[in-house]
Every structure is written in structure tokens, then in C-alpha cells.
């Protein structure tokens, strides 16, 4: 296993609709054809997997149908979007990139993006 540098923004504020997008950029030392991207959430020293996708270079990222993540790739950059976020989901979202094929296997883990989320104000009751 060889180390690889992964860069991501330090802080992002999600939209009022609970959507946060950020770029995860990795310094690919070679010509990888198969890449796996995993988003991990760290909150109070507990780490959980948010979503993961494996893609072939030049193709779209494919997350599971029920995933809260979507993404696109361009060269050594992955543009990740996480949807359905609520205030309780505020935390550090870490991008993990693995170059799966061809060998050698490379692993890179970013420092994390602190995503802040605020629940939208409830709409005032309207009289009909």
C-alpha cells in the first residue's frame, strides 16, 4: 500500500436545502484506470461510512441507488455532492481515495471538510 495526497476544502456551509458539494482532489502518481472514492463522517471521534463508489477513469461515479451522495469525476478531481443533510449531520466529512487498478495500490485520505448544516426555518402557518 502506497500513500497518496488528497486535498479537500476545510469548511463548507450546506445550502438551505441541505445540499453540500465539494471537490476531492488526489495526486495520482500513475495512470489509474479504476478508482474507489469513499466519504467518511467523523463526529466526536466516531467514524462512519457515508457512501462509496468505484469508477473507471472517464466514466461517471456510480453510487448505490439509496445513497445520499452523487458525484462526477474529471481527471484527478471528484466533485462530490451530499444531499438530505440536517443540522444533526454537521461534522467532518473525510474523502478517502483508493487507486485500485492497475497495481500498485495507492491509498489517500484527506484532512476532511467540516460541513455545517442548518435546518431550514419552518414555514409560518398560513390561514386558508
Amino acid at each position: 500500500c502506497k500513500a497518496m495526497h488528497v486535498a479537500q476544502p476545510a469548511v463548507v456551509l450546506a445550502s438551505s436545502r441541505g445540499i453540500a458539494s465539494f471537490v476531492c482532489e488526489y495526486a495520482s502518481p500513475g495512470k489509474a484506470t479504476e478508482v474507489r472514492v469513499t466519504v467518511l463522517r467523523q463526529a466526536d471521534s466516531q467514524v462512519t461510512e457515508v457512501c462509496a463508489a468505484t469508477y473507471m477513469m472517464g466514466n461517471e461515479l456510480t453510487f448505490l441507488d439509496d445513497s445520499i451522495c452523487t458525484g462526477t469525476s474529471s481527471g484527478n478531481q471528484v466533485n462530490l455532492t451530499i444531499q438530505g443533510l440536517r443540522a444533526m449531520d454537521t461534522g467532518l466529512y473525510i474523502c478517502k481515495v483508493e487507486l485500485m487498478y492497475p497495481p500498485p495500490y495507492y491509498l489517500g485520505i484527506g484532512n476532511g471538510t467540516q460541513i455545517y448544516v442548518i435546518d431550514p426555518e419552518p414555514c409560518p402557518d398560513s390561514d386558508f
Partner: antibody, heavy 117, light 107 residues
């Protein structure tokens, strides 16, 4: 090294608006947020809200909602805070601060805004 | 919004004495609590992050502890240059909030 340099002191009349700037250097501007914190004479720190320089999204404290606008110009790594309908109790030192995962790690030197008729 | 309360409001201390400032949150904030020092006519400065993590360049006499709702800033062996206001701040949930501050002066 990281630096946040703010615009100079302002004297305004009640009802007017003020726009304070905060120029960042020494880091990738879009990787962090900028918060605006004010301090009235002899008082504590009050967070007015912040802007994510990465995407321009804003979160304003309820007290200032509708009266404050925070923006960024990523081409010049500058953040702005505009406060409208100024009142005498808006007289304060206004600070910009870099929003990191761990609180506000760098602060500007402060801008005094005096509101007086 | 999360409300932070600090005690005491004011403390007058002799040099070399130990100072303890407490900060209580209205709900659990994990370890997302940070401490700032503000000397007269200066900008605030980050002192401790995540309740207990030290900041490069900050003297080792400053330390923090706590998690959940109760936090403490300790200054071991106070020096004259430590005369300042100290604020706690939470980044657990929006909006960000500060405690009202504790003013420390030298006897």
C-alpha cells in the same frame, strides 16, 4: 503567514449603511469561511453570521437577518459585510475571522463603526 | 441556539496563582468548544481548540478540559501578560455562539 486586513474606521448617521471589507492572504481563500463578529464598547463578542467562501452560502444570526449581507470576491480573496439601517447601538468594533473546523483561528484587526447623528 | 454561560464574570488574581474559568452549554456540544483570549485593544486570539487541544505558540500554562456541556479553561501560574478577557465559543451547531466572557485582572 495567514493575515486578515480590514478596512478603516467609519462614522455613519442613523439609517445609513456601512460596508466593511476583509482582505485575506497566506492561505487558499475558498477553503475556509469568514465570520463577522462585533463587539460593542465594553461588551462581549457577538457573532453576526458567516459566509462559506467555497460556495457563497451564508448563515446569519437571527438578530441581523434582513439587515446584514455578507459576500466574497474570490478573485481578490476579500470578504465584505454590509449592515443597513444603522442605529446608535450598532456602534461597535467589527471583526472578520477565518472559520476553520476548529473555531475562528485567525482574526482581522477590527474596524470601528461609529453611528452618531 | 446553543447558549453558553461562563463563570466567574470577573476574577482578580495575583501572579503565579492558578485560574479556573468554566463554560456551560445549554445542550451537549461534544468537544466542539474553543477558548479565546482578548487583551485590551486587541483582536481575540484562539487559545484552545476542541475543548482541550493546544494551539501552536500558546504557552503551556493554558489548558482546557471537558466535553458535553461542562468545560474548563485553566491558567497555571498566571503571569501579568495574561490579564485579558476570556471567551468560550461553540462550533457544534449553527448559529455559532460565544459565552459572555470572563475578565481576568492582576492584583
Amino acid at each position: 503567514q495567514v493575515q486578515l486586513v480590514q478596512s478603516g474606521a467609519e462614522v455613519k448617521k442613523p439609517g445609513a449603511s456601512v460596508k466593511v471589507s476583509c482582505k485575506a492572504s497566506g492561505y487558499t481563500f475558498t477553503n475556509y469561511g469568514i465570520s463577522w463578529v462585533r463587539q460593542a464598547p465594553g461588551q462581549g463578542l457577538e457573532c453576526m453570521g458567516w459566509i462559506s467562501a467555497y460556495n457563497g452560502n451564508t448563515n446569519y444570526a437571527q438578530k441581523f437577518q434582513g439587515r446584514v449581507t455578507m459576500t466574497t470576491d474570490t478573485s481578490t480573496s476579500t470578504a465584505y459585510m454590509e449592515l443597513r439601517s444603522l442605529r446608535s447601538d450598532d456602534t461597535a468594533v467589527y471583526y472578520c475571522a477565518r472559520v476553520a473546523a476548529a473555531g475562528f483561528d485567525y482574526w482581522g484587526q477590527g474596524t470601528l463603526v461609529a453611528v452618531s447623528s | 441556539e446553543i447558549v453558553l454561560t461562563q463563570s466567574p464574570d470577573f476574577q482578580s488574581v495575583t501572579p503565579k496563582e492558578k485560574v479556573t474559568i468554566t463554560c456551560r452549554a445549554s445542550q451537549s456540544i461534544g468537544s466542539s468548544l474553543h477558548w479565546y483570549q482578548q487583551k485590551p485593544d486587541q483582536s481575540p486570539k484562539l487559545l484552545i481548540k476542541y475543548a482541550s487541544q493546544s494551539i501552536s505558540g500558546v504557552p503551556s500554562r493554558f489548558s482546557g478540559s471537558g466535553s458535553g456541556t461542562d468545560f474548563t479553561l485553566t491558567i497555571n501560574s498566571l503571569e501579568a501578560e495574561d490579564a485579558a478577557a476570556y471567551y468560550c465559543h461553540q462550533s457544534s451547531s449553527l448559529p455559532f455562539t460565544f459565552g459572555p466572557g470572563t475578565k481576568v485582572d492582576i492584583k
